[in-house]
Interface confidence: medium
């Protein structure tokens, strides 16, 4: 693959959730996601998963959803191999593993749906001595974790059945998985559950089929069965009101898609703790996310995150539809093993794309909360090194918030041109407008273009063209000049805003390859997420914690929106989990001190529903990261509290967990937190890791933005996957970001091994 | 202390739907997954399918068209209902919590055999 | 569907050292540390050893280990013991679907 950069923009908040193409399975098998739903009344099982982003119906959060421990799925997402990030030992597809190699070790963190699955278990039970496989699916993790291992499996992720009742998209709207590509991050998850087929709602898309049976199942959960793959081309998401594709949007801000910005200074990924929090934070555009595919090349990325001052978060809303990446499926995945998923199971399975998705948009009255806006530029580098410039599917957003304001989301699918593996699916951009004076936060990666803050975000599609997302509603500059009138403190309530999950590139079945990144299909789309060794000089660094409400656009629960607060001011507040104490802010020199501190994240276990488990991944919209000096210490999210919410993109069902969120003594998230919140735009399944990234590259002040952070991850070998992306978890962490998916076998498997405590 | 009973019917005429619960105690079906696995006498264990902590299912795609798998939040259980039954299916049936690679505690297994 | 191929026997003295392969491919073994291993005794429902590819679960003697190489996950016991003997499972997912391997039977001699 080339090296397309991706350039995403940080933001705190977004206005909307940004839909992604459809995700498929790479596996062979597309999970159906029943879209029964569970005997139980109330919010489907999956936290954040909107049915319509993933095209597996989410199933409303259960009262009892809540997840009350993590199971060693969810510790053994946290396992993943934090090793470089190349090396998760999903990612790696012949990567060995020495016996008695720990969980971390094993590089087990990040799995696919499945995985996810299995990972809760095991988390939830360190001491039962249950392994954390869940089902074999589980990710491999602490003991117990063993089911979340299976997860991991290179097999596509299953797409976990939704529950039927859930909300369909509407035809056309869901997510479909044009290619098997999409699947990619699920094979991982097939690898630990094998082809499981989840069957979810009847998917609308083209080629979407209700899956057969199970209807009458009273399951709660979402029936979708992601163990089809799907096949169905991608919905056409309508166009912008304005008239405009969505891509032309992207286009009109004007980048230099591989530039990095202007100034950028490499930071270490903890500068971001030591970003004084003063530094406001616009809300960032809707991801403009692309992930490039590359079956064989690791992707290098290279994150400039640029911290811009005062700008309203508002301004990013605009640009929201997501640029699709397609992603090589896994070695040996490939149409082979999605032929079976082709089949009826994929046309069972097809989940419709969440091409209209929108993000609901924040009441224009509110306040638009200063948060530091961090542009983060992701470079990411086929394993050869060569980037191609050549942009495939370019999806552009409008640089303002305002022309995409009452357009409904648009998430064209477009399947990778070129690309002949099935299980590479390019994400569909999803454009969600969002009126530009909502303060709507979602955090995505957005790609700037040119000065405006719009970023173009480069993917390779597997046939080696490059897509440019488009900025998701960068403001212009002078946008975030007005931004500045309207700020509010920086500081933010401790209460946490709606999971930044929206921030995450989308994990939609666009992207076969995001899919679950731990499915075993798809090595690229397998997320790895080793924490990358910083110089043994520098301290291991806390982030400042940035949460950012992801909102989904179809669904107002999951947008679970905290009433716009003014944000305290955050000059004289400490923030203890991001230790933005060590951050020096100065004015004018924009000069920040970052103290190279590693975070130690070896210590930190995602715990349910912890964002510190979000995967982001590439291609993401901007993600806005808000450097909330949040005293989490005293704060535990309780069952329904929005730190539980997960929100999935595409079905706005918010899943509320019961799991009380300890972030006393631990900047460690817990499962259910927003931390592990992954937004994946298209209604890419969240995958929640415990890897954290530490931003090993120099930290300079970069005086426009404040900061940018330039992260390079180190080439995987053997591993395509692009999801190395890293997120700042509301602790602050960064985390880096496998785009796996809960929605997928892999993810399930992760979530069981890591509940098992894995 | 982490527990999964299955229950059902331990005979069931060919063609007809075998129906199994699983109930659990000691964790949520809510926030664990729930697999099902089968095992014919003397034979590997076969990975029917699961309902993840997200409220997906998965199925194994060669009885997907025939099983189906549902949750109860609300009583802790997890059914799994096939369909179609044949002498092949006899098996001893295990729910378990986890997915697959991770599944940590098993049920003790139900007999459930399939003869007209 | 996928397959997980296991010798189907192996057998091992007391305190010796006995390796038990499962091989996959890049779809499900080799693309990631998500195997699982599993020890069943006949009548019994299986024990989770090993899940993560080397994660030991909880509870499990250290002389277990699982590791992997390329598409084979092998499970590694050191210093057999009697009470070893029994079936071996290996399990992974892929595309969405989770499955054991062939199975191992393991004799201690």
């Known amino acids: 693959m080339a090296e397309p950069r991706q350039e995403f923009e940080v933001m705190e908040d977004h206005a909307g959730t940004y839909g992604l193409g459809d995700r498929k399975d790479q596996g062979g098998y597309t999970m159906h996601q029943d879209q029964e739903g569970d005997t139980d009344a109330g919010l489907k099982e999956s936290p954040l998963q909107t049915p319509t982003e993933d095209g597996s119906e989410e199933p409303g959060s259960e009262t009892s959803d809540a997840k009350s421990t993590p199971t060693a799925e969810d510790v053994t997402a946290p396992l993943v191999d934090e090793g470089a990030p190349g090396k998760q030992a999903a990612a790696q597809p012949h990567t060995e593993i020495p016996e008695g190699t720990t969980a971390e070790e094993a590089g087990i963190g990040d799995t696919p749906s499945l995985e996810d699955e299995a990972a809760g278990h095991v988390t939830q039970e360190p001491e039962s001595g249950k392994v954390v496989q869940e089902g074999f699916l589980r990710e491999p993790g602490p003991p117990g974790l063993s089911h979340q291992l299976m997860s991991g499996m290179p097999g596509a992720p299953l797409l976990p059945e939704g529950p039927r009742e859930a909300t369909r998209q509407p035809s056309g709207t869901g997510p479909e998985d044009t290619e098997g590509g999409r699947h990619a991050p699920e094979l991982l998850k097939h690898q630990l559950l094998g082809d499981l087929h989840q069957e979810g709602p009847p998917l609308k898309g083209a080629g979407g089929k209700e899956r057969p049976g199970s209807k009458e199942e009273v399951d709660e959960d979402r029936d979708v069965d992601e163990s089809s793959p799907q096949d169905s081309p991608p919905s056409k998401a309508s166009p912008a009101q304005d008239g405009r594709p969505p891509q032309t949007a992207a286009r009109e801000a004007t980048s230099i898609p591989g530039f990095p910005a202007e100034g950028a200074i490499p930071l270490p990924v903890d500068f971001l703790s030591k970003v004084s929090t003063e530094i406001p934070a616009s809300e960032p555009d809707g991801p403009s996310v692309g992930r490039a595919k590359g079956q064989d090349a690791p992707l290098e990325f290279t994150f400039h995150v640029e911290i811009t001052p005062n700008v309203q978060k508002e301004q990013a809303h605009s640009e929201e539809h997501l640029g699709r990446a397609a992603f090589p499926g896994a070695p040996g995945e490939g149409p082979e093993a999605r032929g079976p998923s082709l089949g009826e199971d994929t046309k069972e399975a097809d989940l419709p794309e969440p091409s209209e998705k929108q993000p609901a948009a924040a009441p224009r009255g509110k306040p638009v909360s200063r948060v530091p806006q961090l542009k983060a530029r992701m470079v990411s580098k086929s394993k050869d090194g060569t980037g191609s410039d050549d942009k495939k599917a370019k999806t552009s957003t409008r640089s303002s918030a305002k022309t995409l304001k009452n357009r409904p989301c648009l998430s064209p699918k477009h399947p990778t041109p070129g690309s002949s593996d099935p299980l590479i699916q390019p994400s569909s951009p999803a454009v969600c407008p969002e009126p530009p004076s909502s303060p709507k936060y979602v955090s995505s990666v957005t790609s700037r273009t040119g000065s405006s803050g719009a970023k173009e975000m480069k993917l390779k599609g597997a046939d080696g063209k490059t897509k440019i997302a488009t900025p998701r509603g960068a403001a212009p500059p002078g946008q975030k000049g007005q931004a500045n009138a309207t700020r509010i403190p920086a500081k933010t309530p401790p209460a946490p805003k709606t999971p930044p999950s929206s921030g995450e590139p989308p994990k939609s079945g666009d992207r076969s390859g995001y899919s679950s990144p731990g499915s075993p299909g798809t090595p690229g789309s397998r997320s790895r997420t080793p924490s990358l060794p910083t110089p043994p000089t520098r301290e291991p660094k806390k982030v400042a914690v940035v949460r950012t409400p992801p909102k989904s656009p179809s669904s107002a629960k999951s947008r679970l929106q905290t009433a716009p607060v003014p944000m305290p001011d955050l000059k004289n507040v400490k923030s203890k989990i991001g230790s933005t104490e060590n951050l020096k802010h100065q004015p004018g020199g924009g000069k920040v001190q970052i103290i190279n501190k590693k975070l130690d994240l070896s210590n930190v276990q995602s715990k349910c529903g912890s964002k510190d488990n979000i995967k982001h991944v590439p291609g993401g919209g901007s993600v806005q990261i808000v450097y909330k000096p949040v005293d989490l210490s005293k704060v535990t999210s309780k069952c329904g509290s929005l730190g539980n919410i997960h929100h999935k993109p595409g079905g706005g069902q918010v899943e509320v967990k019961s799991e009380k969120l300890d972030f006393k003594d631990r900047v460690q998230s817990k499962i259910g937190s927003l931390d592990n919140i992954t937004h994946v735009p298209g209604g890419g399944n969240k995958k929640i890791e415990t890897h954290k990234l530490t931003f090993r590259e120099n930290a300079k002040a970069k005086t426009d933005h404040g900061a940018e952070i330039v992260y390079k991850s180190p080439v995987v070998s053997g591993d395509t996957s692009p999801r190395h992306l890293s997120n700042v978890s509301s602790t602050g962490s960064i985390d880096m970001v496998d785009s796996p998916q809960l929605a997928t076998l892999a993810d399930e498997v992760s979530a069981s091994l890591a509940k098992q405590g894995l | 202390q982490v527990q999964l009973q299955e229950s059902g019917p331990s005979l069931v005429k060919p063609s007809q739907t075998l129906s199994l619960t699983c109930t659990v105690s000691?964790?949520?079906?809510?926030?664990?997954?729930v697999a099902w696995v089968r095992q014919a006498p003397g034979k590997v264990p076969e990975w029917l399918g699961a309902s993840g902590s997200s409220g997906n299912k998965y199925y194994n795609p060669a009885l997907k068209s025939r099983l189906s798998i549902t949750r109860d939040t609300s009583k802790s259980q997890v059914s799994l209902s096939l369909s179609s039954v044949t002498t092949e299916d006899t098996a001893v049936y295990y729910c378990a919590r986890g997915i697959i690679a991770g599944v940590d505690v098993w049920g003790r297994g139900l007999l459930v055999t399939v003869s007209s | 569907q996928a397959v997980l191929t296991q010798p189907s026997s192996v057998s091992g003295s007391l305190g010796q050292r006995v390796s038990i392969t499962c091989s996959g491919s890049?779809?499900?073994?080799?693309?990631?540390?998500?195997v699982g291993w599993y020890q069943q005794v006949p009548g019994s429902a299986p024990k989770l050893l090993i899940y993560?590819?080397?994660i030991r679960a909880s509870g499990v003697p250290d002389r277990f280990s699982g590791s992997r190489s390329g598409d084979t996950a092998t499970l590694t016991i050191t210093s057999l013991q009697a009470e070893d003997e029994a079936d071996y499972y290996c399990?992974?997912?892929?595309?969405?679907?989770?499955?054991f391997g062939s199975g191992t039977r393991l004799t201690v001699l």
């Open positions: 399990a992974s997912y892929q595309s969405n679907y989770a499955f």
């Open positions: 890049s779809s499900n073994v080799g693309y990631g540390n998500y």
């Open positions: 993560g590819t080397a």
């Open positions: 000691g964790f949520s079906v809510i926030s664990d997954s």
